[in-house]
Amino acid sequence: ASTQSPSVFPLTRCCKNIPSNATSVTLGCLATGYFPEPVMVTWDTGSLNGTTMTLPATTLTLSGHYATISLLTVSGAWAKQMFTCRVAHTPSSTDWVDNKTFSVCSRDFTPPTVKILQSSCDGGGHFPPTIQLLCLVSGYTPGTINITWLEDGQVMDVDLSTASTTQEGELASTQSELTLSQKHWLSDRTYTCQVTYQGHTFEDSTKKCADSNPRGVSAYLSRPSPFDLFIRKSPTITCLVVDLAPSKGTVNLTWSRASGKPVNHSTRKEEKQRNGTLTVTSTLPVGTRDWIEGETYQCRVTHPHLPRALMRSTTKTSGPRAAPEVYAFATPEWPGSRDKRTLACLIQNFMPEDISVQWLHNEVQLPDARHSTTQPRKTKGSGFFVFSRLEVTRAEWEQKDEFICRAVHEAASPSQTVQRAVSVNPGLAGGSAQSQRAPDRVLCHSGQQQGLPRAAGGSVPHPRCHCGAGRADWPGPPELDVCVEEAEGEAPWTWTGLC
């Protein structure tokens, strides 16, 4: 992937949801869509003291770009204070910085809809000497708005006195006009109407439509998820075709098997994207046994706008196998968020990289949307690792203080799953005193008894990594749950917490 600078968004709560007597409050900053790592997030808290925490970066599934969140917790007279989140991305350029200044919370308002309309071609389908762009800003709660026109991202010197505002009932609308010469319009530049309102930015962009199909149609073919393969036992593979121009010609996707055997009936979905391109998805159910035995599946794509047919193949990953090690732990209580807690799960040293991560509570699998899991990343060795993060509420842990992180992976035995239980308050879990039983959150390699080192000949923890049961045969202080070896070019992850 090529270098991509981040988009930065402020994260605030609604003012009405913050108790008036709250002594501290948390706000955040999301940096998303960047590549490669890292970004550096710093905060300007004015006269107030604050503590910051930047979460590990997550990989965005389709693009392979990264996203990360930085949280700031401040106490004191925060209500009248403005805070600035400063995001630096040196891979974009040494001085690439984006600042977002905002207050702790946002008041209720109806945001505007921004839409650019453009003047028509003449009867012969040709562009007139000048082209008018009309920016319609509609349906917002009356208040100050700021309209800026951009040409290829650069602010234009435009007379905005022509902008007119009208009010219909409780909502307002504004429109601004931009006149361009035919030469500018045909130069293939992108024109953006950018609206700033209530500290937020809304925009719409337009450019001369391409004469033909957007270049660079791409096709991708996924492997079945281990969850679908081993737990649901109904694996599917998906052929994804992106960046097609909507046209009269339809995309033709044909499935086949290298063995020549027939394929099942596939389902197809077409979606128009915001950039005007079309995405086509075809999903094919495959036989669990066929897949495990190494069948190769092929997706052939043809389209009038594709110079030649595209073929994508997928089959079971070859190479060495290694079962995942699963470690689960709870973060300590954070000031001002006593009713929420974050659980984390480190899954590492597995091969190949295909893995499914689930969280369970009360023997029920939690929806995938509840947790955020990074894409597999290579460890220093030959395996892969992922982190998964789950936010739980007091109501949940008071109902039952046991959450399970489960990894589904082909090399895990006996049933392709490895799981670890974690409690928010491990000393109280199950009504037993911690000293009377093996703690829930002693972090050990998968496949071994909790708190006990692997049998002779098996792998033992690295000297820098700890299983904090306070046992003499494990190195390191008892309060350290686990320390993951520093990966190349990255800061070391260190997790602490009472065992």
Partner: antibody, heavy 119, light 110 residues
Framework: QVQLVESGGGLVQPGGSLRLSCAAS????????MTWVRQAPGKGLEYVSI???????WYANWASGRFTISRDNSKNTVYLQIDSLRAEDTATYYC?????????????WGQGTLVTVSS | DIQMTQSPSSVSASVGDRVTITCQAS??????LAWYRQKPGQPPKLLIY???TLASGVPSRFSGSGSGTEYALTISSLQPEDFATYYC????????????FGGGTKVEIK
């Protein structure tokens, strides 16, 4: 077996025109994208143009305007029309068949027809 | 445009030698890199497609590898008929302005 036979090459003066033909046999032409590739004497392969199964066509940027690719599936023939010929167009022109399943290159080539542009 | 850069432009080797030719694309290729062998006076012949799949009838001494932007063709034990010129081709889809072939590598007798 699959056969591609080019014809229409020869000696032509600068500024002249030529229409190259490629007769296909041993397979169903309408199932395949077809390509013209040229090779100047002692030089490497150079992609000229491609026509897909829908009849839509693309050209190398230097070829756009003077070269026209077309196909007649009923006659099992692919054509390449070259106008305003220049000395640098002197080359062997190969007609080639793209693999049916796609993304896999050219699985069959003709023997080529030599075009010589000289006054 | 995706540009294909082949190296070396020529290599001298003997029968039985192991020879590796590389091809670098100016941007990632998802699938569809092909390799050809061309003998003097003949059209090219497809050796490898989809990065690493051996074309029908091609001896197993030929192998293809690579992903993203870096690709290689390896001849494990050079035979007399392998003294020829080799070309890589980006065969995923032809953009109208691409020359989809590499510049060629001539394998000569030492």
């Amino acid at each position: 077996q699959v056969q591609l036979v080019e014809s229409g090459g020869g000696l032509v003066q600068p500024g002249g025109s030529l229409r190259l033909s490629c007769a296909a046999s041993g397979f169903t032409l309408s199932n395949h994208d077809m390509t013209w590739v040229r090779q100047a004497p002692g030089k490497g392969l150079e992609y000229v143009s491609i026509i897909n199964t829908y009849g839509n066509h693309w050209y190398a940027n230097w070829a756009s305007g003077r070269f026209t690719i077309s196909r007649d599936n009923s006659k099992n023939t692919v054509y390449l029309q070259i106008d305003s010929l220049r000395a640098e167009d002197t080359a062997t022109y190969y007609c080639a068949r793209e693999t049916h399943h796609g993304s896999s290159g050219i699985d069959h080539w003709g023997q080529g027809t030599l075009v010589t542009v000289s006054s | 445009d995706i540009q294909m850069t082949q190296s070396p432009s020529s290599v001298s080797a003997s029968v039985g030698d192991r020879v590796t030719i590389t091809c670098q694309a100016s941007e990632s290729i998802y699938s569809g890199l092909a390799w050809y062998r061309q003998k003097p006076g003949q059209p090219p012949k497809l050796l490898i497609y989809d990065h690493s799949t051996l074309a029908s009838g091609v001896p197993s001494r030929f192998s293809g590898s690579g992903s993203g932007t870096e690709y290689a063709l390896t001849i494990s034990s050079l035979q007399p008929e392998d003294f020829a010129t080799y070309y890589c081709q980006h065969a995923d889809y032809a953009h109208h302005s691409d020359n989809v072939f590499g510049g060629g590598t001539k394998v000569e007798i030492k």
